[in-house]
């Protein structure tokens, strides 16, 4: 899973923001469920979907200079 | 079908420069906003970079701040990763994955199949 160090309780976001809960910051709410991918073919293994929400949790985040 | 190719992985000596490119079909990327995750060998998923959907939000984790560039072409419908002095420590599968949001939060939606990135002298 993804989970880093203890991180503090999700803060309240805006209305027009989502809280992230891998980089630990509220940013704008963007494309809502992403499609899931058909099944793959036999000869490539079917891609990742959706880490459980509860296990989404990151390190440390930086917001860039 | 949604589809995410990552490419630019390879080995390379420490504190050389590396570029991983994911090219993205199959959804509307430009309101998407997306991650770059890894897994080094034997350990679990490391979250190491987001970018908005129009760059205007971008965050590190702090083991690759200063060192490495997100960024995202919304024409080509491709994420970027720009690698700098790279470490043994980056050696991972890199994936790109896109931001599924819903009930107020966001998370990892739909992953690469990866590539791999080899730091070693």
């Known amino acids: 899973s993804l989970r880093g160090r203890d991180a503090p309780a999700p803060t309240p976001c805006v209305p027009a923001e989502c809280f992230d809960l891998l980089v630990r910051h509220c940013v704008a709410c963007g494309l809502l469920r992403t499609p899931r991918p058909k099944p793959a073919g036999a000869s490539s293994p079917a891609p990742r979907t959706a880490l459980q929400p509860q296990e989404s949790v990151g390190a440390g985040a930086g917001e860039a200079a | 079908e949604v589809q995410l190719v990552e490419s630019g992985g390879g080995v390379v000596q420490p504190g050389r420069s590396l570029r991983l490119t994911c090219a993205a079909s199959?959804?509307?990327?430009?309101?998407?906003?997306m991650y770059w995750i890894r897994q080094a060998p034997g350990k679990g998923l490391e979250w190491v970079s987001y970018?908005?959907?129009?760059?205007?939000?971008?965050y590190y984790a702090d083991s690759v701040k200063g060192r490495f560039t997100i960024s995202r072409d919304n024409s080509k419908n491709t994420l970027y990763l720009q690698m700098n002095s790279l470490r043994a420590e980056d050696t991972a599968v890199y994936y790109c994955?896109?931001?599924?949001?819903?009930?107020?939060?966001?998370?990892?939606?739909?992953w690469g199949q990866g590539t791999t990135v080899t730091v070693s002298s």
């Open positions: 994955v896109t931001q599924s949001c819903g009930a107020g939060k966001c998370y990892p939606g739909v």
């Open positions: 199959g959804f509307t990327f430009s309101t998407s906003g």
């Open positions: 970018i908005s959907s129009s760059s205007s939000t971008i």
